[in-house]
Interface confidence: low
């Protein structure tokens, strides 16, 4: 009867103790060791039959007495050298060897392409003991072969530190062609030649390639793998695939789209992200890139005022990040804005134009011709000025801010006055006598306070002095105007 022993962590002796009675001679295997999970030594045995002395680490058997027959050198018997089968079929092959019972601690292992097979394979070793030798048959089976099972299999037996190696058994798994290189999708310039590559392998070889364009075969005669298809040029998008044929049948590659590079679509959704008096931040959504990366974009800006000369300002920028701040614009003005982007083929059409406005800004210049004089009789200082040019007000004038600083004997105080937009003069009370009064004026819009004028100084004497001439904003270059008596 066959007894099966599941593998454990330790190797186990073939004969656990003295073997009772005579040895089996009917070649019924005494012990089978299935190798289903992790690898364990296939054979470890210690024959301890009565009257059979151990002879130590012997590799090639020697004659030990007159009655003993010489034992043959240890070698695996020849077996089938080459097995060809189809994918998913089952296969079983084996190695066999006869080992004199004098040997202890022998192991059989299976190797594939130089690497030991350590698990997930079904290997069974069976033993047929005789009075002098034990025949060992190591079987290896694969229930459903795959291409990865291709290779050279050998058995190895370790016996007293010597290694015995079987002849190789070559397993050749044949199946449908298997692609090692498939055509890749490409973006190409119209009417420009390009190459596609397809490579497939067996076994069985040879593998022949047919090319398919838009579901129609390109080549009437197949080409041996690998195949390079040179396409002289396309005028419109096409889908290519390749068919690989061998004796087992046909495999079709993934279809790949070859796109024709084109001018991009115009950007969409141009929108205003932020507006100031002199700049507008815009964003846009790029159109379809025409199968060629965007290189840069152009922002076109024209004044929307019907009386403007219709000139267009152009600002160039990188394609990313779909955001641009248009600068150097006039305050409180209306503009039409369009965006166009380019790739290696050319410029897109301009996006739909959008209307945008700059906001009111603070005036960019100060009031002009500031004049200050003392009206001693009423103890007032009179201030006069001219309003800044309308273009430079950057908004609707809402008034003026007057700063007057009084300095006398180490004391300094600043006062601010607000006056309405209609006037161009103001009167302020004298705060301190025997002091210098410094006056500056700024125009004010809803956008803020503009720059202050250059300071104008006037000396306010003690009571009882004579009347004085006015002090005024100096001509350019006079840094510190003072009253001349």
């Amino acid at each position: 009867a066959i007894t099966e022993a599941r593998e454990e962590a330790k190797p186990y002796p073939l004969f656990p103790g003295p073997f009772p009675g005579s040895l089996q001679t009917d070649h019924t295997p005494l012990l089978s060791l299935p190798h289903a999970s992790g690898y364990q030594p296939a054979l470890m045995f210690s024959p301890t039959q009565p009257g059979r002395p151990h002879t130590g680490n012997v590799a090639i058997p020697q004659v030990t007495s007159v009655e003993s027959k010489p034992l043959p050198p240890l070698a695996f018997k020849h077996t089938v050298g080459h097995i060809i089968l189809s994918e998913h079929k089952g296969v079983k092959f084996n190695c066999s060897i006869s080992v004199p019972n004098i040997y202890q601690d022998t192991t059989i292992s299976w190797w594939k392409d130089g690497k030991e097979l350590l698990g997930a394979h079904h290997a069974i070793t069976q033993f047929y003991p005789d009075d002098e030798v034990t025949a060992i048959i190591a079987s290896f089976s694969i229930t459903s072969v795959q291409r990865s099972d291709n290779g050279s299999y050998i058995c190895k037996m370790k016996i007293n530190n010597e290694e015995i190696v079987s002849d190789p058994i070559y397993i050749e798994v044949q199946g449908l062609p298997h692609f090692t290189k498939q055509p890749e999708s490409m973006n190409v310039t119209r009417n420009t030649a390009f190459n596609l590559t397809c490579q497939a392998v067996g076994p069985p070889e040879p593998v022949n390639i047919f090319w398919v364009q838009n579901s129609s075969r390109v080549n009437e005669q197949p080409e041996k793998s690998p195949s390079v298809l040179t396409v002289p040029g396309l005028t419109e998008m096409a889908v290519f695939s390749c068919e690989a044929h061998n004796d087992k049948g046909l495999t079709v590659s993934k279809g790949v789209q070859i796109n024709i590079k084109a001018i991009p679509s115009p950007p969409t959704e141009v929108s205003i992200r932020n507006s100031t008096a002199h700049s507008i931040l815009i964003s846009w959504v790029p159109g379809f890139d025409g199968y060629s990366p965007f290189r840069n974009c152009s922002i076109q800006v024209k004044e929307a005022d019907p009386l403007s000369n219709g000139s267009v300002m152009i600002f160039n920028t990188s394609a990313l990040p779909h955001l641009y701040q248009i600068k150097q614009l006039q305050a409180l003005a209306n503009y039409s804005i369009g965006v166009s982007c380019m790739n290696e083929i050319g410029w897109s059409a301009v996006s739909p134009w959008i209307l945008a406005s700059t906001t009111e800004g603070a005036p960019s210049v100060a009031p002009l011709n500031v004049t200050v004089f003392l009206n001693e009789s009423s103890d007032n200082v009179d201030i006069r000025w001219m309003k800044p040019p309308t273009k430079q007000q950057d908004g609707e004038l809402v008034g003026y801010r007057i700063s007057h600083v009084w300095q006398s004997a180490g004391i300094s105080k600043e006062l601010l006055e607000e006056v309405g937009q209609n006037g161009s003069r103001a009167r302020i009370s004298v705060q301190v006598h025997n002091a210098t009064c410094t006056v500056r004026i700024a125009a004010v819009t809803r956008g803020g306070v503009g720059p202050f004028s250059d300071p104008v100084k006037i000396f306010i004497p003690a009571h009882g002095w004579v009347d004085y001439a006015p002090s005024s904003t100096p001509a350019p270059g006079n840094a510190d105007p003072v009253l001349i008596i």
Partner: antibody
Framework: QVQLQQSGPELVKPGASVKLSCKAS????????INWVKQRPGQGLEWIGW????????KYNEKFKGKATLTLDTSSNTAYMGLHSLTSEDSAVYFC?????????????WGQGTTLTVSS | EIVLTQSPTTMAASPGEKITITCSAS???????LHWYQQKPGFSPKLLIY???NLASGVPARFSGSGSGTSYSLTIGTMEAEDVATYYC?????????FGAGTKLELK
């Protein structure tokens, strides 16, 4: 405009099979792969596989081989995914998505998802 | 397979804040093959950025992406309430196509 319309929710018993559908419209059906993606409740996205409508070829994530089967009906521009030997682990939302293949691979349009509940 | 690791797993942000989510690949992915998706609760994912830095149609310009090799990032310039979602990176270089585990972005 491009649309992927998926079939309604399914409640099935363990061990059973189910077939989910994804109807495409608004583009040339045979030009783009249809991909299937799994999302378990509160979890991330897992790619199951694609089917290429031009020739019916499929590519599976090894993890889903034997679990999912991808098929097509090109006459109705519909892709199907069969799921077999269902267990509670298969309870998830399954999305179909169009694969944009242009020297890269991303999913530019998605279906609304089909909720599959496996429960006895 | 290529494993994509996203960080952080979850984060909370206030409107107006700048947000950065990173995606690290276990092996090099050409920038052409790295994409980002946004999934709002109860909805299917939506393509946000393709080829590392290209905004998909209709995506606001406050989103941007960058990176190369094994390291990529998604940035929201100024967080808005409508950006509450889970964000996934995805590689299209090697089958199986894989996604990052996701970054859940919540409102503070």
């Amino acid at each position: 405009q491009v649309q992927l319309q998926q079939s309604g929710p399914e409640l099935v018993k363990p061990g059973a099979s189910v077939k989910l559908s994804c109807k495409a419209s608004g583009y040339s059906f045979t030009t783009y792969d249809i991909n299937w993606v799994k999302q378990r409740p509160g979890q991330g996205l897992e790619w199951i596989g694609w089917i290429y409508p031009r020739d019916g070829s499929t590519k599976y994530n090894e993890k889903f081989k034997g679990k999912a089967t991808l098929t097509l009906d090109t006459s109705s521009n519909t892709a199907y995914m069969g799921l077999h030997s269902l267990t509670s682990e298969d309870s998830a939302v399954y999305f179909c998505a169009r694969g944009y293949y242009d020297n890269l691979y991303y999913f530019d349009y998605w279906g609304q998802g089909t909720t599959l509940t496996v429960s006895s | 397979e290529i494993v994509l690791t996203q960080s952080p797993t979850t984060m909370a942000a206030s409107p107006g804040e700048k947000i950065t989510i990173t995606c690290s690949a276990s092996s090099s992915v050409s920038s052409n093959y790295l994409h980002w998706y946004q999934q709002k609760p109860g909805f299917s994912p939506k393509l946000l950025i393709y080829r590392t830095s290209n905004l998909a149609s209709g995506v606001p310009a406050r989103f941007s992406g960058s990176g190369s090799g094994t390291s990529y990032s998604l940035t929201i310039g100024t967080m808005e309430a409508e950006d509450v979602a889970t964000y996934y990176c995805q590689q299209g270089r090697i089958v199986p196509l894989t996604f990052g585990a996701g970054t859940k972005l919540e409102l503070k």
